[in-house]
């Protein structure tokens, strides 16, 4: 039976059919971050749980040292949510000399690192000013989109301030990717 | 022609090929919630429209009694947005004795229920402090991620306060899942 | 070899198998918007980058004149993030006569246009009151969900105020869709 008998008329003959169940996939969940040095003007990367609870990696998608390693070229949907929480925000203080303070902010970046390319690529960024009146505040930033990745690419999640990340529950802060 | 001639070299032979069009999928949209009693310390579950307007269920993914029923084991992408709106928030009142009030909050949880397991599992949570200065406020919480589910699992969306959910438009508050 | 030997027992025989790599897909990124006339009570549509940087269209998914053109009927996952930024918000001013002002707001709508249907359909809406105490504020609205689309449907992203859209970085404001 010819393969193209299954295929819509526009399918390229050479495109391989593929079982969905064997595609690279990962869902990583938050863990408490270990104190690490990071450069002043560089957002620190989060590290993740990859096998306990809701977390998993499968079909050659591996997690190592804060990175998800892309095992196969293709189009991937990549997503992350980071829940931040804090205990006041400077700009809620009384304005000095009638001039509002620069607002605090929280930022999440999903970054791609390609060994053959010197600079990391920012794939997705969610950034929000935080100017809360109440004493303690909390809020999530969610990101998700599709990107063409190459075998060997590495993905990480960077945040503006690691100390504000809510690491208490695996459903609040997470990171995942799957081959489409 | 042998099936594996279509397959990339890393494909497990036993993985079945599968037509995408017959995978379980659902997109549910908000309806006005009917007045029901719910326990004080338990977040109430939303019920949904499953066939009118933009809403649909297909390929054995069924909606019944606030639950999406998973018909087949596999990896699913699950998502929801809930738009909340309210007409004040207590912490916007003048601070008593110079001390800010504990903020109000809004929370969405996507929950999995497995009959063989006594406790529901929280898959995703979006939670946000609400401390609005203006009189009426509104904002969405969006969630989405991939999970390995088993046939017979049930999914629901719980919220911290059903009365704050914006039920007026199907594009503002919704819930969906699809087999990858 | 018979096709159904690949298929789970519940697969409809007539459903064509399909190589994932040839499915219509697009990820569009923000560009600076050119000033255009738009009607007072109609949210303006954003236009997008479709080939430079992270942006791409493939497999007959075309971008033209603010629209993504759907080349094939099926279920699509559609997503967008718009990052807004501004320089104060009226409702942070002192309340007049004890009555809070109506809050400002930011809104994103993903809209479907079907030539045979007179009215556009709003698929997704993210709307948020903005009542910031600080001077300059910024925040994203993210949307994503699955919809059944028909060949020839057109998708666009509309916003409440084009002048508040952050067009500075391709990772902050984007729009995409892919056939499932």
């Amino acid at each position: 039976l010819k393969g193209q008998e299954f295929a819509p008329s526009h399918q390229q003959v050479y495109a391989p059919l593929r079982a969905d169940g064997d595609k690279p996939r990962a869902h990583l969940t938050v863990v408490r971050q270990t104190p690490t040095q990071h450069f002043k003007n560089q957002f620190p990367a989060l590290h993740w749980e990859h096998e306990l609870g809701l977390a998993f990696t499968k079909n050659r998608m591996n997690y190592t040292n804060k990175f998800l390693l892309i095992p196969e070229s293709g189009d991937y949907f990549i997503y992350s949510q980071v829940t931040f929480r804090g205990m006041t925000s400077e700009c809620s203080e009384i304005r000095q000399a009638g001039r509002p303070n620069k607002p605090d902010s929280i930022t999440v970046v999903i970054t791609k690192v390609t060994d053959s390319y010197p600079e990391p690529t920012q794939l997705l960024m969610g950034t929000k000013s935080v100017c809360e009146v109440g004493s303690n505040w909390f809020q999530p930033i969610y990101l998700g989109a599709m990107f063409s990745l190459q075998e060997g690419d590495k993905l990480m999640v960077n945040v503006s301030d690691i100390s504000l990340v809510d690491y208490t529950k695996e459903d609040k802060t997470f990171f995942g990717a799957f081959l489409l | 022609l042998k099936g594996q001639e279509f397959a990339p070299s890393h494909q497990q032979v036993y993985a079945p090929l599968r037509a995408d069009g017959d995978k379980p999928r659902a997109h549910l949209t908000v309806v006005r919630q009917t007045p029901t009693q719910h326990f004080k310390n338990q977040f109430p579950a939303l019920h949904w429209e499953h066939e009118l307007g933009l809403a649909f269920t297909k390929n054995r993914m069924n909606y019944t009694n606030k639950f999406l029923l998973i018909p087949e084991s596999g990896d699913y992408f699950i998502y929801s947005q809930v738009t909340f709106r309210g007409m004040t928030s207590e912490c916007s009142e003048i601070r008593q004795a110079g001390r800010p009030n504990k903020p109000d909050s809004i929370t969405v949880v996507i929950t999995k229920v497995t009959d063989s397991y006594p406790e529901p599992t929280q898959l995703l949570m979006g939670t946000k402090s609400v401390c609005e200065v203006g009189s009426n406020w509104f904002q969405p919480i969006y969630l989405g991620a991939m999970f390995s589910l088993q046939e017979g699992d049930k999914l629901m969306v719980n919220v911290s306060d059903i009365s704050l959910v914006d039920y007026t438009k199907e594009d503002k508050t919704f819930f969906g899942a699809f087999l990858l | 070899l018979k096709g159904q030997e690949f298929a789970p027992s519940h697969q409809q025989v007539y459903a064509p198998l399909r190589a994932d790599g040839d499915k219509p897909r697009a990820h569009l990124t923000v560009v600076r918007q050119t000033p255009t006339q738009h009607f007072k009570n109609q949210f303006p549509a954003l236009h997008w980058e479709h080939e430079l940087g992270l942006a791409f269209t493939k497999n007959r998914m075309n971008y033209t004149n603010k629209f993504l053109l759907i080349p094939e009927s099926g279920d699509y996952f559609i997503y967008s993030q718009v990052t807004f930024r501004g320089m104060t918000s009226e409702c942070s001013e002192i309340r007049q006569a004890g009555r809070p002002n109506k809050p400002d707001s930011i809104t994103v709508v993903i809209t479907k246009v079907t030539d045979s249907y007179p009215e556009p359909t709003q698929l997704l809406m993210g709307t948020k009151s903005v009542c910031e105490v600080g001077s300059n504020w910024f925040q994203p609205i993210y949307l994503g969900a699955m919809f059944s689309l028909q060949e020839g449907d057109k998708l666009m992203v509309n916003v409440s105020d084009i002048s508040l859209v952050d067009y500075t970085k391709e990772d902050k404001t984007f729009f995409g869709a892919f056939l499932l």
Epitope: - | R32, T34, Q37, G86, M87, E90, S135, S163 | -
Partner: antibody
Framework: QVQLVQSGAEVKKPGASVKVSCKAS????????INWVRQAPGQGLEWMGW????????GYAQKFQGRVTMTADRSTSTAYMELSSLRSEDTAVYYC????????????WGQGTLVTVSS | QSVLTQPPSVSGAPGQRVTISCTSS?????????VHWYQQLPGTAPKLLIE???NRPSGVPDRFSGSKSGTSASLTITGLLPEDEGDYYC??????????FGGGTKLTVLG
């Protein structure tokens, strides 16, 4: 202009049912929820429930659950409220009211229908 | 179950100002959809007067205003007129979005 016109007064015996109609005009009937509110003689207003004319979905006050049924006929832009197992304390003026979607305030009211329950 | 409490009656002379309060038994009155006020003149159906604490529908004179503080909302009528005499109801919602009405306040215009 928006109008809600209700059916005429009814006299019913205890244990019977009554069905009150509310014909809408001047707007798209399926775009706004209809509520029913009653007022016993000399008493205050009491909410009974809401009806979405588009989907047919309803929400009833706990007090009336099991006894009230709200329906809509989209072809005639008419909402109905049926109350069963009537008792003397159901004697009241019954109002239909159209809601403002954003705030659920009752913006337009019918003129009211007096239902008297007497043996 | 939340309860909205209004004074049974208030009165004032023409030209005066009167305020009708509406107090909730729960922590924050109308947190979801606000508090609405209705006027019911003798022998007529209720009429929406104030929507969402503060907002007057078109056609409602600016003599009518609404406010909110903590667990109570208020309707204030300035420059009282004889034709304002009637019953006034506040309305809000409980946690399941069931509508609640206050018991009503009878306004008498003296003289």
């Amino acid at each position: 202009q928006v109008q809600l016109v209700q059916s005429g007064a009814e006299v019913k015996k205890p244990g019977a049912s009554v069905k009150v109609s509310c014909k809408a005009s001047g707007y798209t009937f399926t775009s706004y929820d209809i509520n029913w509110v009653r007022q016993a003689p000399g008493q205050g207003l009491e909410w009974m429930g809401w009806l979405n004319p588009n989907s047919g979905n309803t929400g009833y006050a706990q007090k009336f659950q099991g006894r009230v049924t709200m329906t809509a006929d989209r072809s005639t832009s008419t909402a109905y409220m049926e109350l069963s197992s009537l008792r003397s304390e159901d004697t009241a003026v019954y109002y239909c009211a159209r809601e403002v979607p954003e705030t659920a305030a009752f913006e337009y009211w019918g003129q009211g229908t007096l239902v008297t329950v007497s043996s | 179950q939340s309860v909205l409490t209004q004074p049974p009656s208030v009165s004032g002379a023409p030209g005066q100002r009167v305020t009708i309060s509406c107090t909730s038994s729960s922590s924050d009155i109308g947190a979801a959809l606000g508090v609405h006020w209705y006027q019911q003149l003798p022998g007529t159906a209720p009429k929406l007067l104030i929507e969402g604490y503060y907002n007057r529908p078109s056609g409602v004179p600016d003599r009518f205003s609404g406010s909110k503080s903590g667990t109570s909302a208020s309707l204030t009528i300035t420059g009282l007129l004889p034709e304002d005499e009637g019953d006034y109801y506040c309305q809000s919602f409980d946690g399941t979005l069931s509508a609640l009405f206050g018991g009503g306040t009878k306004l008498t215009v003296l003289g």
